[in-house]
C-alpha cells in the first residue's frame, strides 16, 4: 500500500538544518547574520535575561498550544438534545423571586438515556434563544452546586440586538459531572453580572421559554425553542469498538 | 526552484472523492453504507431536522475555527516589557480604600516607546506574580474606561497554592486601544468576583508589588517582580518592509 | 491566507485550496445520507517550492520564504490548515441519527 | 498522537516526529544568537500509506484509516501538528534584543 524508498536520514537532517538557517534569518528579515563587532564583552544584562526568561516560561492562564485531537475525536459524534424541564415543575418554586436571575433545570435521566457513560460525552452546549435586547448586558452562568450554592461557570457580554439570537455556552465538564453523580434534577442559573460597587443588577435579557414578567413565574414555553442541552457523544457500541482496538499501528 | 509536472486535476479529484468515501464510513465505523430498507417513507421528522439545524448553525459564543495566522505573524516579534507605575504615584490616591480591588497603572509614553504604532502590536500580556494563597479565589480583571467607570475584561479562578506563581492575562486589544488614544496614564483593576447575593467580596490573593496590609497603601515594590506588561510587536523597520512587499507570490 | 476567498478567485498555481463539491448521490452513489444532499469538501493542491538554496539571490528568497516553507520542512507539502465539521442525518434501521463528522471541510491550506 | 512521547520511544516507520537538536554554533556556524545555545527543532518524517483501496480487506482498512489519512487527502503527507515558539537574544550593534520566533519547534506530526 505504500511506495517504499530508503530514506537517507542524514540528507533529510541536513536539508532541515539548511531550511532552519533560512527560516531564522527570514523571520528576522535579515539577509545575513548581524555583525558581532560592537557586542559589549561580558554576560548579558540582567534585565535582558529577565525578559528572555519571561518570554520562555509558560504562565498560568496563558493559552498553551492546542492539544492534538485524541483518536476518539476522529470518529463521528452522535448529536442529541435534552430540553429544559418545563417551568411549571415544582423545582422552580423556590427560585421564583429573583429579578437578577433565571433558572434552568434538566432531568438527568434524560441525559443518561442520551449519554450512558460520562466518558462518552465529547461536548455539551447549553443553548438559549435570546429575544431582542435594548441595552448591552453582561451575564453570568452558574451551575447548581449543593443545596443552596451556585458555582460560577462563565460569562458573556451581550450586545443590543433587534432580532432573536441563539446563545451557546460550553458546559461539557458540568454535564460530565452530572452523568457521574446520582442526582435526579440538575440546573443552571443565568444572572446579571454584579460588580462590587454597582447595585443595578436586573437581568434585562429575555430568554425564550420564560414569560417576560417576573422571571421565575410560570412560563409560556414557545415550542421547541426553550433552553436545551445539545450533546455530542460517542455512541456506546462505537466506544466499545474503540476500547478493543487500543493498539498502535 | 520547483520541479514542474502537469497535474491531472480530474485524477486528484477522483482520488479525493474515493478518500472521502472511506473517511465518512470510517468516521461512522461502518464497514459499508447502512441499508435503507427500513427507512420510513416521507420527509424527516421535524425534531430530527431541528436537531440537524441546531448542529449545523454556528451560534453566538461558540468557538469558531481558529483563523489562519496572518503573514505578519510569520516574522519575529520583538519582546519588551513595561513595568507598572510605582504605587507611590499620586494616580493611586483616589483608589486607596477598597478591600475588594487592587489597581495597576501604566505610563502610555513608555508603551509608545516600545510600540510606536498600534498595528505593530501582536500580543500584550498583563503579568502578575501571585503570592501564596490559602483559599480558592475568583478574580476579575477590569480596564479603566472613562472618568470613574471600569470595563470588565476577563476572570480567573485561582486555586490555593503554597508557592508564588505568575498569572498572565491577554490584554492585547486594550493596549492597542491605549496606543491609539491620547491618554497619559491608563490602568487595570483586579477585583474579587462579586456575586449578586453574596456579600463577602474581599480580595484574598496577594499580588507582588503591593503590601499585604490595606491593598492600596504605599507599597513595597519587590524588584522587577511588580506587575508588568509583556509586549510582543513587529519592529517598525520590519513593518515598513512588510507593507512595501504586500504582493501575492 | 491561502483560503477560499483568495484561492477561488485567483489562478494561483502554487499551494492553494481548490473547489470540490461532493454530491452524495452522484459522486459516491449513496442514498443513505438524508441531510445534507452534498457538501463543499474542497482540497489542497499545488507545489510548495523549496526555495531555500544558497545559490539563489538571498534577498528575493527571504521575501518568499514564509509563503513556501514557513515550517522549514525538508520537503514542504500543501496541506489543510483550517477545517470545519459536517453534521449529517442518516438512518440506522428505522431510527434517524444526527452525527457530527469532524474536519470534513477544507477552508484553507498551507505549505508545511 | 504522533508526538515526542510516542515517537522518540518507538521505532515507528510511518509518519512520526523525529529528534533533531540544532546547536547554533556547531550546526549553523553562528555565534550571533546569545540565548539559547541551541534548541530541539525536530522534524516530521515517514510515509502516510494511502490505504484506501477497494482490493484491501475493508475492515482492516477502517481501523487504520484515521491514522494514515484522517483528512481524506488525495496524497496524504507527514507534516507538523503542534508547533511551539522559540525566544532568542541577539545584538543589533550594541543593543541586545529579545525576539520571539513563531512555530519553530515541532512537538507532533500528523498525516494530512
Amino acid at each position: 500500500l505504500s511506495t517504499c524508498k530508503t530514506i537517507d536520514m542524514e540528507l533529510v537532517k541536513r536539508k532541515r538544518i539548511e531550511a532552519i538557517r533560512g527560516q531564522i534569518l527570514s523571520k528576522l528579515r535579515l539577509a545575513s547574520p548581524p555583525s558581532q563587532g560592537e557586542v559589549p564583552p561580558g554576560p548579558l544584562p540582567e534585565a535582558v535575561l529577565a525578559l528572555y526568561n519571561s518570554t520562555r516560561d509558560r504562565v498560568a492562564g496563558e493559552s498553551a498550544e492546542p492539544e492534538p485531537e485524541p483518536e476518539a475525536d476522529y470518529y463521528a459524534k452522535e448529536v442529541t438534545r435534552v430540553l429544559m424541564v418545563e417551568t411549571h415543575n415544582e423545582i422552580y418554586d423556590k427560585f421564583k423571586q429573583s429579578t437578577h436571575s433565571i433558572y434552568m433545570f434538566f432531568n438527568t435521566s434524560e441525559l443518561r438515556e442520551a449519554v450512558p457513560e460520562p466518558v462518552l460525552l465529547s461536548r455539551a452546549e447549553l443553548r438559549l434563544l435570546r429575544l431582542k435586547l435594548k441595552v448591552e448586558q453582561h451575564v453570568e452562568l452558574y451551575q447548581k452546586y449543593s443545596n443552596n450554592s451556585w458555582r460560577y461557570l462563565s460569562n458573556r457580554l451581550l450586545a443590543p440586538s433587534d432580532s432573536p439570537e441563539w446563545l451557546s455556552f460550553d458546559v461539557t465538564g458540568v454535564v460530565r459531572q452530572w452523568l457521574s453523580r446520582g442526582g435526579e434534577i440538575e440546573g443552571f442559573r443565568l444572572s446579571a453580572h454584579c460588580s462590587c460597587d454597582s447595585r443595578d443588577n436586573t437581568l434585562q435579557v429575555d430568554i425564550n421559554g420564560f414569560t417576560t414578567g417576573r422571571r421565575g413565574d410560570l412560563a409560556t414555553i414557545h415550542g421547541m425553542n426553550r433552553p436545551f442541552l445539545l450533546l455530542m457523544a460517542t455512541p456506546l457500541e462505537r466506544a466499545q469498538h474503540l476500547q478493543s482496538s487500543r493498539h498502535r499501528r | 526552484l520547483s520541479t514542474c509536472k502537469t497535474i491531472d486535476m480530474e485524477l486528484v479529484k477522483r482520488k479525493r472523492i474515493e478518500a472521502i468515501r472511506g473517511q465518512i464510513l470510517s468516521k461512522l465505523r461502518l464497514a459499508s453504507p447502512p441499508s435503507q430498507g427500513e427507512v420510513p417513507p416521507g420527509p424527516l421528522p421535524e425534531a430530527v431536522l431541528a436537531l440537524y439545524n441546531s448542529t449545523r448553525d454556528r451560534v453566538a459564543g461558540e468557538s469558531a475555527e481558529p483563523e489562519p495566522e496572518p503573514e505578519a505573524d510569520y516574522y519575529a516579534k520583538e519582546v519588551t516589557r513595561v513595568l507598572m507605575v510605582e504605587t507611590h504615584n499620586e494616580i493611586y490616591d483616589k483608589f486607596k480604600q477598597s478591600t475588594h480591588s487592587i489597581y495597576m497603572f501604566f505610563n502610555t509614553s513608555e508603551l509608545r516607546e516600545a510600540v510606536p504604532e498600534p498595528v505593530l502590536l501582536s500580543r500584550a500580556e498583563l503579568r502578575l506574580l501571585r503570592l501564596k494563597l490559602k483559599v480558592e479565589q475568583h478574580v476579575e480583571l477590569y480596564q479603566k474606561y472613562s472618568n470613574n467607570s471600569w470595563r470588565y475584561l476577563s476572570n480567573r479562578l485561582l486555586a490555593p497554592s503554597d508557592s508564588p506563581e505568575w498569572l498572565s492575562f491577554d490584554v492585547t486589544g486594550v493596549v492597542r486601544q491605549w496606543l491609539s488614544r491620547g491618554g497619559e496614564i491608563e490602568g487595570f483593576r483586579l477585583s474579587a468576583h462579586c456575586s449578586c447575593d453574596s456579600r463577602d467580596n474581599t480580595l484574598q490573593v496577594d499580588i507582588n508589588g503591593f503590601t499585604t496590609g490595606r491593598r492600596g497603601d504605599l507599597a513595597t515594590i519587590h524588584g522587577m517582580n511588580r506587575p508588568f506588561l509583556l509586549l510582543m510587536a513587529t519592529p517598525l523597520e520590519r513593518a515598513q518592509h512588510l507593507q512595501s512587499s504586500r504582493h501575492r507570490r | 491566507a491561502l483560503d477560499t476567498n483568495y484561492c477561488f478567485s485567483s489562478t494561483e498555481k502554487n499551494c492553494c485550496v481548490r473547489q470540490l463539491y461532493i454530491d452524495f448521490r452522484k459522486d459516491l452513489g449513496w442514498k443513505w445520507i438524508h441531510e445534507p444532499k452534498g457538501y463543499h469538501a474542497n482540497f489542497c493542491l499545488g507545489p510548495c517550492p523549496y526555495i531555500w538554496s544558497l545559490d539563489t539571490q538571498y534577498s528575493k528568497v527571504l521575501a518568499l520564504y514564509n509563503q513556501h516553507n514557513p515550517g522549514a520542512s525538508a520537503a514542504p507539502c500543501c496541506v489543510p490548515q483550517a477545517l470545519e465539521p459536517l453534521p449529517i442525518v442518516y438512518y440506522v434501521g428505522r431510527k434517524p441519527k444526527v452525527e457530527q463528522l469532524s474536519n470534513m471541510i477544507v477552508r484553507s491550506c498551507k505549505c508545511s | 498522537a504522533l508526538d515526542t512521547n510516542y515517537c522518540f520511544s518507538s521505532t515507528e516507520k510511518n509518519c512520526c516526529v523525529r529528534q533533531l537538536y540544532i546547536d547554533f554554533r556547531k550546526d549553523l556556524g553562528w555565534k550571533w544568537i546569545h540565548e539559547p545555545k541551541g534548541y530541539h527543532a525536530n522534524f516530521c518524517l515517514g510515509p502516510c500509506p494511502y490505504i484506501w483501496s477497494l482490493d484491501t480487506q475493508y475492515s482492516k482498512v477502517l481501523a487504520l484509516y484515521n491514522q494514515h489519512n484522517p483528512g481524506a487527502s488525495a496524497a496524504p503527507c507527514c507534516v507538523p501538528q503542534a508547533l511551539e515558539p522559540l525566544p532568542i537574544v541577539y545584538y543589533v550593534g550594541r543593543k541586545p534584543k529579545v525576539e520571539q520566533l513563531s512555530n519553530m519547534i515541532v512537538r507532533s506530526c500528523k498525516c494530512s
Partner: antibody, heavy 120, light 107 residues
C-alpha cells in the same frame, strides 16, 4: 468467536405449533438485529423476519408468507432468540436458520440450522 | 418485492479456472448486494457484502463487482474446497430476497 446454535426442530402435524430457539454467544446480543431464514428441501433461501436491536426498540418485521402465523421474540438476559410458529402448513417444511443481521443489509453469521418437518 | 435472478443455475469447472456467477435484480438495488456460500450439508457463510467487500476470513480469490441491477461474483482460481451452492441477496428494500442459487461442481 460468534456462535449461533438452533434447537427445537422436529416433526409436527399440519395446523400444529412449535417454538424454535437460537442460543447466541461471542458478541453483544442487544446491539444486533436477529433474523430467521429458512430453506425448503432442494430450494433456495427465504427470509422470514427479524427482531430489531435495543436502539430500535426490539420491534419486529415479517415477510408476507409468515405474517400473522409466526412470531419472533428474544430474551436478552439469556442471549436467546425464538421463533414461535402456529398454524403450520406442509410447505413450512424446511431447515430453519437463525442469523445475525447487520445494518448493512446482510447476514454476517448463521447457525447450523434445525429441521422442521410438517406432515400428517 | 424485488426479484433476484441468478445465472447459471449450475456450473462445472476445473481447478484453477476463473469463473463468474451473475445476479440480476428486478430494480436498482444501489450496491446492496451480498453473496453467500453453502457447502453440501453445511451452514451458510457470508462471502461478500455491499457488492465488493470481502467478509473477514474469506480468501482473496473471491471478488464482487457490479452496480444498478447487475452484479457478479468472480472466483479467480477455482479450488476444490469451493464446491458449494452460491446465493445472492439484496439488502436494499424489505423484504430481503435471495436468488435461487448457483450450484458449483468440479469437473
Amino acid at each position: 468467536e460468534v456462535q449461533l446454535v438452533e434447537s427445537g426442530g422436529g416433526l409436527v402435524q399440519p395446523g400444529g405449533s412449535l417454538r424454535l430457539s437460537c442460543a447466541a454467544s461471542g458478541f453483544t446480543f442487544t446491539d444486533y438485529y436477529m433474523s430467521w431464514v429458512r430453506q425448503a428441501p432442494g430450494k433456495g433461501l427465504e427470509w422470514l423476519g427479524f427482531i430489531r436491536n435495543k436502539p430500535n426498540g426490539y420491534t419486529t418485521e415479517y415477510s408476507a408468507s409468515v405474517k400473522g402465523r409466526f412470531t419472533i421474540s428474544r430474551d436478552n438476559s439469556q442471549n436467546s432468540l425464538y421463533l414461535q410458529m402456529n398454524s403450520l402448513k406442509t410447505e413450512d417444511t424446511a431447515v430453519y436458520y437463525c442469523a445475525r443481521y447487520t445494518g448493512g443489509g446482510y447476514f454476517d453469521y448463521w447457525g447450523q440450522g434445525t429441521l422442521l418437518t410438517v406432515s400428517s | 418485492d424485488i426479484q433476484m435472478t441468478q445465472s447459471p443455475s449450475s456450473l462445472s469447472a476445473s481447478v484453477g479456472d476463473r469463473l463468474t456467477i451473475s445476479c440480476r435484480a428486478s430494480q436498482d438495488i444501489s450496491n446492496y448486494l451480498n453473496w453467500y456460500q453453502q457447502k453440501p450439508g453445511k451452514t451458510v457463510k457470508l462471502l461478500i457484502y455491499y457488492t465488493s467487500r470481502l467478509h473477514s476470513g474469506v480468501p482473496s480469490r473471491f471478488s464482487g463487482s457490479g452496480s444498478g441491477t447487475d452484479y457478479t461474483l468472480t472466483i479467480s482460481s477455482l479450488q476444490p474446497e469451493d464446491v458449494a451452492t452460491y446465493f445472492c441477496q439484496q439488502g436494499d428494500t424489505l423484504p430481503w430476497t435471495f436468488g435461487q442459487g448457483t450450484k458449483l461442481e468440479i469437473k
